[in-house]
Interface confidence: low
């Protein structure tokens, strides 16, 4: 399927609008500090060039690879060395090393200002004045802050963003219409970014085999009526799509994702009965819908797994002759029977099965050796079940904010070297598992909770990788993708940690806290809580609770005072002294 001009091929397949949007996303994800106007200029130049190639595929440079064309364009940026430092060295390399170099310099936590939402009228005016620029700015701002955001999905978010403004800027109460929609898009966007970041980490840190195993398990749960051959085909295609997007090949990724959605909808009879509604939607909505579709019903009367995977005399023969296909079949058969298990649990079971066969198929009596392999699964299944039960009970008892605080304390004691903003962000997200998953019935709790925790812990891993400070975090993040959560759960208080020096400045607050939103105020308090634990890692729950209650009362009192700033200064000193006494600092 070779094309004379790859850039012409993708332009024709995707259309000008999507082509331009995807090139903008690609450039913003690579050069995260570049001003918007510079990126727009580069995108327009690439688009004009692509059009010349569409007109004549034999025209000069049209035969060059997309990496060569895009890399050459990025390397024309005048301020590359000043803005990006050593990333400029990438431009001295040839493809494919140059693209790999750009990928390695993607920054998960770029030093960019927080996005502040303007007044609704200001946004509506900007939207009406220049809709195209307004929407491009959205793509640019999201892409540069989330350099691994799933590009075709970002097009779907942009479509919803446009729809929200189109509808709400005409509404009687613009704010009441628009703000909830923007909040929803923001929260969904953060979740989507984090989910995709795990897929890219899986591919880049653990390889294609790890990603394919994840995909076999998840698709088998989702499409339990599909045959193994069908699931295998979907896994192969899905792996290609995500490999491309994670590798910065956004045009190919979006094109292949559209092809995959088309294939799924043309073959839905042999995939799932739940796809009908998705397949009636336009392309971007269709792809999103398929990715989120509920699990199909399990076929009735599935035979016991033991027949093929334990009792059969062919187990070692089958395993030896085609290890990955046999293990893939095991994972497929186990996953389609267990929509109630998390994907990571299913992968742990498959790993245990693989390890057992590796050992037993070399033994004198293989069958005798692996006959009890399914018994080894019991503790692996019970561990997340018990953990979720305990944590959901704690969540129901405390509510989300205090549950987050319990996790903040727990994780700060485990890995106190990690930066306070990272501990706050990660623990707050870990705490959201309660409201997200504990409402579900038993059969849906584990896949919801443990697979969500995998996404959140990956955030910790990628942020920590940028500036590693804890051997324990490095160990849990790198040893095994599927055992990350059990690894972190098993960590006890770090006895080697030398408590942080007490710094009164850390606990000095001002009147500006009174004007913050409830969420931002919580973050301030949670930041103080992490700092407290770092100063006094041996502090008991009761001591910490007492100090936090005093702190909450202090903020409430001073925010009601006439002279707020004086109150914060004077009462703050008293609070610090009382806290030091209470904690023995």
């Amino acid at each position: 399927d070779a094309h004379k001009s790859e850039v012409a091929h993708r332009f024709k397949d995707l259309g000008e609008e999507n082509f331009k949007a995807l090139v903008l996303i690609a450039f913003a994800q690579y050069l995260q500090q570049c001003p918007f106007e510079d990126h727009v200029k580069l995108v327009n130049e690439v688009t004009e060039f692509a059009k010349t190639c569409v007109a004549d595929e034999s025209a000069e440079n049209c035969d060059k690879s997309l990496h060569t064309l895009f890399g050459d364009k990025l390397c024309t940026v005048a301020t590359l060395r000043e803005t990006y430092g050593e990333m400029a060295d990438c431009c001295a390399k040839q493809e494919p090393e140059r693209n790999e170099c750009f990928l390695q310099h993607k920054d998960d936590n770029p030093n960019l200002p927080r996005l502040v939402r303007p007044e609704v009228d200001v946004m509506c005016t900007a939207f009406h004045d220049n809709e195209e620029t307004f929407l491009k700015k959205y793509l640019y701002e999201i892409a540069r802050r989330h350099p691994y955001f799933y590009a075709p999905e970002l097009l779907f978010f942009a479509k919803r963003y446009k729809a929200a403004f189109t509808e709400c800027c005409q509404a009687a109460d613009k704010a009441a219409c628009l703000l909830p929609k923007l909040d929803e898009l923001r929260d969904e966007g953060k979740a989507s970014s984090a989910k995709q970041r795990l897929k890219c980490a899986s591919l880049q840190k653990f390889g294609e085999r790890a990603f394919k195993a994840w995909a076999v398990a998840r698709l088998s749960q989702r499409f339990p009526k599909a045959e193994f051959a069908e699931v295998s085909k979907l896994v192969t295609d899905l792996t290609k799509v995500h490999t491309e997007c994670c590798h910065g090949d956004l045009l190919e990724c979006a094109d292949d994702r559209a092809d995959l959605a088309k294939y799924i909808c043309e073959n839905q009879d042999s995939i799932s009965s739940k796809l009908k509604e998705c397949c009636e939607k336009p392309l971007l909505e269709k792809s999103h819908c398929i990715a989120e579709v509920e699990n199909d019903e399990m076929p009735a009367d599935l035979p016991s797994l033991a027949a093929d995977f334990v009792e059969s005399k062919d187990v070692c023969k089958n395993y030896a002759e085609a290890k990955d296909v046999f293990l893939g079949m095991f994972l497929y058969e186990y996953a389609r029977r267990h929509p109630d298990y998390s994907v990571v649990l299913l992968l742990r079971l498959a790993k245990t099965y693989e390890t057992t066969l590796e050992k037993c198929c070399a033994a004198a009596d293989p069958h005798e050796c692996y006959a009890k392999v399914f018994d080894e699964f019991k503790p692996l299944v019970e561990e997340p079940q018990n953990l979720i039960k305990q944590n959901c009970e704690l969540f129901e008892q405390l509510g989300e904010y205090k549950f987050q605080n319990a996790l903040l304390v727990r994780y700060t004691k485990k890995v106190p070297q990690v930066s306070t903003p990272t501990l706050v962000e990660v623990s707050r997200n870990l705490g959201k598992v309660g409201s997200k998953c504990c409402k579900h019935p038993e059969a849906k709790r584990m896949p919801c909770a443990e697979d969500y925790l995998s996404v959140v812990l990956n955030q910790l891993c990628v942020l920590h990788e940028k500036t590693p400070v804890s051997d324990r975090v490095t160990k849990c993040c790198t040893e095994s993708l599927v055992n990350r959560r059990p690894c972190f759960s098993a960590l006890e208080v770090d006895e080697t940690y030398v408590p942080k020096e007490f710094n009164a400045e850390t606990f000095t607050f001002h009147a500006d806290i009174c004007t913050l939103s409830e969420k931002e105020r919580q973050i301030k308090k949670q930041t103080a809580l992490v700092e407290l634990v770092k100063h006094k890692p041996k502090a008991t729950k009761e001591q910490l609770k007492a100090v936090m209650d005093d702190f909450a009362a202090f903020v409430e009192k001073c925010c009601k005072a006439d002279d707020k700033e004086t109150c914060f200064a004077e009462e703050g000193k008293k609070l610090v002294a009382a806290s030091q006494a209470a904690l023995g600092l």
């Epitope: 009526k225 045959e227 042999s270 076929p299 062919d314 089958n318 002759e321 085609a322």
Partner: nanobody, 115 residues
Framework: QVQLVESGGGLVQPGGSLRLSCAAS????????MSWVRQAPGKGPEWVSA????????RYTESVKGRFTISRDNAKKTLYLQMNSLKPEDTAVYYC????????GSQGTQVTVSS
């Protein structure tokens, strides 16, 4: 790429015979047990018969015992189902699958038993 392609279906009178074939590619055919599954109009898939990787151990659903015979040729990477004494209730789309799964895969081959 794992692929299974069935053939040999058709229209046959009650009491007649048909031989279905399933050509496999993309995996080590000789390493896996295989099955035939069928789906009658308006009904769910039903497991019909299975055979182990070497061809020695065969299993059948009660309604086809004594009438159907499953076999395989590992050298040709092909699975067979010989169907004798066919009845109208055998009318269905027949699929071959890997392992003892009762799910439908590929396109299947239509078998219609009618006078």
């Amino acid at each position: 790429q794992v692929q299974l392609v069935e053939s040999g279906g058709g229209l046959v009178q009650p009491g007649g015979s048909l031989r279905l074939s399933c050509a496999a590619s993309g995996f080590t055919f000789g390493s896996f047990g295989m099955s035939w599954v069928r789906q009658a109009p308006g009904k769910g898939p039903e497991w019909v018969s299975a055979i182990d990787s070497g061809g020695a151990d065969t299993r059948y659903t009660e309604s086809v015992k004594g009438r159907f015979t499953i076999s395989r040729d590992n050298a040709k990477k092909t699975l067979y189902l010989q169907m004798n004494s066919l009845k109208p209730e055998d009318t269905a789309v027949y699929y071959c699958t890997i392992g003892r799964s009762i799910s439908r895969g590929s396109q299947g081959t239509q078998v219609t038993v009618s006078s």
